[in-house]
């Protein structure tokens, strides 16, 4: 049979932040290209990136339809310039990657603090809302429409002339804490999903602190 | 002020589907809280269903969940409850709440504020 | 699932007394994810307390909340008669949330 020369990928990995999902493999092509197919456990194979010299293969426009099903998918090896070859046993060769589930598996973006404001001993900071790819009645949903409660904030805070931090945690977006009338403020917040097993947290969002150029309200 | 109203059928047969409606007013089902159902088995004490975000986002009682759906209908500012399979051990008085933030220790937390009266569901042919 | 025990099943109390309500937790409650509710015959629970400690709106005062991990107390400082009713502990921290047996405030 013609597939002499095509070897089956490997190391096949999921990559996924906020539910944009890019299946990666090895290895680069020589004289081979791929073709990638997903489905749930209960469904038909849908193919993706037909041929294609990457190897890489976005399947973000196939997870988000449900995010909580979970996926499998496959990457066929065919040589070059004859994609119709198969292997001794009748089909191309190809290798299964790991099974995926959006929901529990994505990891959660870096969190970005939208806004602070300062009245008297009481400081709100807000945590800006970020937008995913999953659609919702030909809208893009929030990683809060999505996530609901199972997604909680940590605040971590501490005065900008000590390093001793303090901590608050929230089921919005939103925190209120009460701090020293005068000091200035330095802060960062962390996305977390308790329940899950897994990619549970984010990175930490960029440090904000009180008092600098931006002033004391930033939008 | 919100109020909530359940409504559906009082009687349902064994094997069937219950299915029950909660309308909200006097505010916007997608003003940032979540929708719960409960329920109270006669004479006993209280049982969470599960909840719903305006966006479509659902948790359920994992003792439930293979029979429950629970979906919104922002245009009609209703949520409702549909459980597959009933026996007699479904029957219960079903009661709908929102789940609104209130400010606790730094952050925000949800609590159910506001409920339904209560509608009595009984399973029997 | 958590397992909230509430105690004791009934209290038998006069007006004017002081209430305490226990609820115990088969493992810990973050403080920002217990309430309390009050239900009377044929009505909806009332929500009296949230983050263990914190009144509801409209709330009167002799209701108070304490306590923390597994051990959580309501205490209703002076009975009034429309106090009598279920008292019931809630967690909203874990799912499935969970609900205690409830304690029934019965006139002496």
């Known amino acids: 049979s013609g597939t002499t020369n095509t070897v089956a990928a490997y190391n096949l990995t999921w990559k996924s932040t906020n539910f944009k999902t890019i299946l990666e493999w090895e290895p680069k092509p020589v004289n081979q290209v791929y073709t990638v197919q997903i489905s749930t456990k209960s469904g038909d194979w849908k193919s993706k990136c037909f041929y294609t010299t990457d190897t890489e293969c976005d399947l973000t426009d196939e997870i988000v339809k449900d995010v909580k099903q979970t996926y499998l998918a496959r990457v066929f090896s065919y040589p070059a310039g004859n994609v119709e070859s198969t292997g001794s046993a009748g089909e191309p060769l190809y290798e299964n990657s790991p099974e995926f589930t959006p929901y529990l598996e994505t990891n959660i973006g870096q969190p970005v603090i939208q806004k602070y404001e300062q009245g008297g001993t009481k400081l709100k900071v807000t945590v800006k809302d970020s937008f995913t790819l999953v659609r919702r009645n030909n809208t893009f949903l929030s990683l809060r429409d999505v996530f609901g409660k199972d997604l909680i904030y940590t605040l971590y805070y501490w005065k900008s002339s000590s390093s001793g931090k303090k901590t608050a945690k929230t089921n919005t977006n939103e925190f209120l804490i009460d701090v020293d009338k005068g000091e200035n403020y330095c802060f960062s917040v962390q996305a977390v999903i308790p329940s899950r097993t897994v990619n549970r947290k984010s990175t930490d969002s960029p440090v904000e602190c009180m008092g600098q150029e931006k002033g004391e309200f930033r939008e | 002020q919100v109020q909530l109203q359940e409504s559906g059928p009082g009687l349902v047969k064994p094997s069937q589907t219950l299915s029950l409606t909660c309308t909200v007013s006097?505010?916007?089902?997608?003003?940032?809280?979540?929708w719960s159902w409960i329920r109270q088995h006669p004479g006993k004490g209280l049982e969470w269903i599960g909840e719903?975000?305006?966006?479509?986002?659902?948790r359920y009682n994992p003792s439930l969940k293979s029979r429950v759906t629970i979906s919104v209908d922002t245009s009609k500012n209703q949520f409702s409850l549909k459980l597959s399979s009933v026996t007699a051990a479904d029957t219960a008085v079903y009661y709908c709440?929102?789940?609104?933030?209130?400010?606790?220790?730094?952050?925000?937390?949800?609590?159910?504020?506001?409920w339904g009266k209560g509608t009595t569901v009984t399973v029997s042919s | 699932e958590i397992v909230l025990t509430q105690s004791p099943g009934t209290l038998s109390l006069s007006p004017g007394e002081r209430a305490t309500l226990s609820c115990r937790a088969s493992?810990?409650?973050?403080?920002?994810?217990l309430a309390w509710y009050q239900q009377k015959p044929g009505q909806a629970p009332r929500l009296l307390i949230y983050?263990?400690?914190s009144r509801a709106t409209g709330i009167p005062d002799r209701f108070s909340g304490s306590g923390s991990g597994t051990d959580f107390t309501l205490t209703i400082s002076r009975l009034e008669p429309e106090d009598f009713a279920v008292y019931y502990c809630?967690?909203?921290?874990?799912?499935?949330?969970?609900f205690g047996g409830g304690t029934k405030v019965e006139i002496k």
């Open positions: 709440a929102r789940d609104t933030p209130y400010y606790y220790d730094g952050g925000y937390y949800y609590y159910m504020d506001v």
């Open positions: 006097g505010g916007s089902i997608s003003s940032g809280q979540y």
């Open positions: 719903i975000y305006y966006s479509g986002s659902t």
């Open positions: 493992q810990s409650v973050s403080s920002s994810y």
């Open positions: 983050g263990a400690s």
């Open positions: 809630q967690q909203v921290g874990v799912v499935p949330y969970t």
